[in-house]
């Protein structure tokens, strides 16, 4: 049977969730007045770029929208973007779509997402509310790169 993406709400240790603002993803406090995105996650079938030490290769999309997370270089810096793309279109491609790929690694009960196109660059939220989700190579105090994937019905 055809594979289906897994659905999660995504949250960090400061109880910030991911929210769609226009065509951007921002971090906002978990709140009744804010509708967090449901993240779609599906494994890549092609093993060309696989590296088990870094985690499983996955595509990340926004449920209910034809939007997927995508890494591209802007002014020489790896940048996280949303691109109009159906996650299942990426999945059915025989060849791995590298800019859309992330290494999904588990660290304790949290998940970490590293760009396949830009090794050492991780999906992150800043400590300030309302800021875009971004890529960073600085893991630590000022950036949060560990996320909780909460099951949603």
């Amino acid at each position: 049977r055809e594979a289906a993406p897994k659905s999660y709400a995504i949250r960090d240790s400061r109880q910030m969730v991911w929210v769609l603002s226009g065509n951007s993803l921002i971090a906002a406090p978990l709140s009744r007045s804010i509708k967090p995105v449901t993240l779609h996650l599906i494994a890549c079938r092609d093993t060309e770029f696989s590296d088990k030490e870094k985690g499983n290769m996955v595509y990340l999309g926004i449920k209910g929208k034809d939007l997927c997370l995508f890494c591209a270089e802007i002014q020489g810096k790896p940048t996280l973007q949303l691109k109009e793309k159906n996650i299942m279109d990426l999945y059915v491609e025989k060849k791995a779509q590298k800019p859309f790929l992330f290494f999904h690694n588990k660290e304790g009960s949290t998940s970490v997402f590293q760009s396949v196109s830009y090794p050492g660059w991780f999906i992150a939220t800043s400590t300030t509310s309302g800021q875009p989700i971004f890529l960073t190579k600085e893991r630590g105090i000022t950036n949060n790169t560990n996320f909780y994937l909460d099951s949603v019905e």
């Epitope: 709400a9 949250r11 109880q15 906002a28 406090p29 709140s31 009744r32 304790g108 009960s109 509310s129």
Partner: antibody, heavy 122, light 111 residues
């Protein structure tokens, strides 16, 4: 319906460790998106959050108590517990366990135990 | 000293309207975390009265309402009744502490 019940000694000696357990009934402690907390209330005073543990096993502690607090879960008994070390008379309080659900109560606590009074005295 | 500030006491006659304020900062209420209100009747455990700033759990009378603006929140009680005499606490989340915070509590006296 989810219910919580605190248990543990009502009297603890100074410098010893206070140990309390909260038994969860009417639901599983491992159910997705739940968080479980300990809150205390010294006699005649207000509520103070001690710490929490959630369904992932992640713990969060009040910075003012962090060095003395441990919260853990026993999934086989459907319980979570509090340990507070090196207690003094200032730790005398009614201790409550409480729970909420991330995407339903939004970091509030909608179910509480009835509370248990712990006195620190020699 | 509590992270969230409430008046120690308020009072009102039966049938009147009273409000209880809760003032936080840019790392809790002002950061858009929700405010929750609890009622604690004498000798009992706190009970959730308002969650998510302005929502009543089932069974809570519509005489109780909550609101939030900026770094502050308020609980309003209309048509005050003798059984409303209790302590009221506000609560939120503070990202700088990575934890839950309470107000110091407000004692409501029905005259």
């Amino acid at each position: 319906e989810l219910q919580l019940q605190e248990s543990g000694p009502g009297l603890v000696k100074p410098s010893e460790t206070l140990s309390l357990t909260c038994t969860v009934s009417g639901g599983s402690i491992t159910s997705s998106n739940y968080y479980w907390g300990w809150i205390r209330q010294p006699p005649g005073k207000g509520l103070e959050w001690i710490g929490s543990i959630d369904y992932t096993g992640s713990t969060y502690y009040n910075p003012s108590l962090k060095s003395r607090v441990t919260i853990s879960v026993d999934t086989s008994k459907n319980q979570f517990s509090l340990k507070l070390s090196s207690v003094t008379a200032a730790d005398t309080a009614v201790y409550y366990c409480a729970t909420g659900k991330y995407y339903e109560t939004y970091l509030g606590f909608d179910v509480w135990g009835q509370g248990t009074l712990v006195t620190v005295s020699s | 000293e509590s992270v969230l500030t409430q008046p120690p006491s308020v009072s009102g006659a039966p049938g009147q309207r009273v409000t209880i304020s809760c003032t936080g900062s840019s790392s809790n209420i002002g950061a858009h975390y929700d405010v929750h209100w609890y009622q604690q009747l004498p000798g009992t455990a706190p009970k959730l009265l308002i969650y998510g700033n302005d929502n009543r759990p089932s069974g809570v009378p519509d005489r109780f309402s909550g609101s939030k603006s900026g770094t502050s929140a308020s609980l309003a009680i209309t048509g005050l009744q003798a059984e409303d005499e209790a302590d009221y606490y506000c609560q939120s989340y503070d990202y700088s502490l990575s934890g839950y915070v309470f107000g110091g509590g407000t004692k409501l006296t029905v005259l």
